[in-house]
């Protein structure tokens, strides 16, 4: 499911429950995706020892995964709500091609991988409604994404395992940073 249990329109309208605010809905959606990532990481970590490797050991890779930096305005120091929101949405849009790559990478967690992908699309929609400055958000080029996907899928098995691990870890870190920032807004 692309939204957490209790998040569809029927449930939200139920008389015994207060409708969630936009911020609460976004918060819950991120936590739901993080739970999904956690399940996917369990499968990848059981298959290889990459999860035990330090970040430094895995730093040398050609992936251009989105990452939060001081200039993005999402950290406590230099916090800027609008700049940060643009970064979060832009980053999530950039992660979409990597989430597409993950779709055929799991055996027992195939549905979970799909749920993470679909839930992220829903999260982007929620955040776009919240953002005032949509013009500042750059959408990735579909042609570039298609060639990146082809390149990633052509890697040998070991590199594909490494790529899967790095995508999940980076996406987790990006969402955690986003959640910390959104809770300050």
């Amino acid at each position: 499911a692309p939204v957490p249990p209790g998040e569809d329109s029927k449930d939200v309208a139920a008389p015994h429950r207060q409708p969630l605010t936009s911020s609460e809905r976004i918060d819950k959606q991120i936590r739901y995706i993080l739970d999904g990532i956690s399940a996917l990481r369990k499968e990848t970590c059981n298959k290889s020892n990459m999860c035990e490797s330090s970040k430094e050991a895995l730093a040398e890779n050609n992936l251009n995964l989105p990452k939060m930096a001081e200039k993005d305005g999402c950290f406590q120091s230099g916090f800027n709500e609008e700049t940060c929101l643009v970064k979060i949405i832009t980053g999530l849009l950039e992660f979409e091609v990597y989430l597409e790559y993950l779709q055929n990478r799991f055996e027992s967690s195939e549905e979970q991988a799909r749920a993470v992908q679909m839930s992220t699309k829903v999260l982007i929609q929620f955040l776009q409604k919240k953002a005032k400055n949509l013009d500042a958000i750059t959408t990735p080029d579909p042609t570039t994404n298609a060639s990146l996907l082809t390149k990633l899928q052509a890697q040998n098995q070991w590199l594909q395992d490494m790529t899967t691990h790095l995508i999940l870890r980076s996406f987790k870190e990006f969402l955690q940073s986003s959640l910390r920032a959104l809770r300050q807004m």
Partner: antibody, heavy 118, light 110 residues
Framework: CQSLEESGGRLVTPGTPLTLTCTAS????????VTWVRQAPGKGLEWIGI?????ETAYATWAIGRFTISKTSTTVDLKMTSLTAADTATYFC??????????????WGQGTLVTVSS | AYDMTQTPASVSAAVGGTVTIKCQAS??????LSWYQQKPGQRPKLLIY???TLASGVSSRFKGSGSGTEFTLTISDLECADAATYYC????????????FGGGTEVVVK
Amino acid sequence: CQSLEESGGRLVTPGTPLTLTCTASGFSLSNYYVTWVRQAPGKGLEWIGIIYGSDETAYATWAIGRFTISKTSTTVDLKMTSLTAADTATYFCARDDSSDWDAKFNLWGQGTLVTVSS
Amino acid sequence: AYDMTQTPASVSAAVGGTVTIKCQASQSINNELSWYQQKPGQRPKLLIYRASTLASGVSSRFKGSGSGTEFTLTISDLECADAATYYCQQGYSLRNIDNAFGGGTEVVVK
């Protein structure tokens, strides 16, 4: 066996800067969040700050500008400036396994005592 | 700010008895609350996280409950070894706060 150890605590005079170091054994700090907490003699736990990745930090309102946390793969430093007698405390570092979104500290060092006195 | 208020400051009970410690957050923190035990001269030890999940190796005599702003730690079948100070800690947001921890509750076992 995984453990954390703080070092650098000593007697200093007011105004002296001091750096405490948290060192990990049995695991790499780069995969974890690390927080600093202090406890004045006979008082409760007081949260100081946390470092997430290599460059994202958060601090208690009273610690901003006077305390700085930085990280390498093996250590996490707490730099303290403009120390006063009120900063006299045992300083603990603690690990957050960073697997979830909520902060919880599941591995603690034994603490290092900082005494500020003239 | 997410201020944590812990009550009572001190509580006394007999061996075999039960004590209840309360922790109140100034704003909702979902279930993102942990409880720690600290004995004199020792480091704190994580007991419970996510309001009700027991940390590894912790006795089931410790029970956490609550969500939103109201939380409770219950220690049943008290043992002498339970004499300690207990702290709650919010893990919801560590930005713009004075302290993530509650003020602590001293448990005296008679």
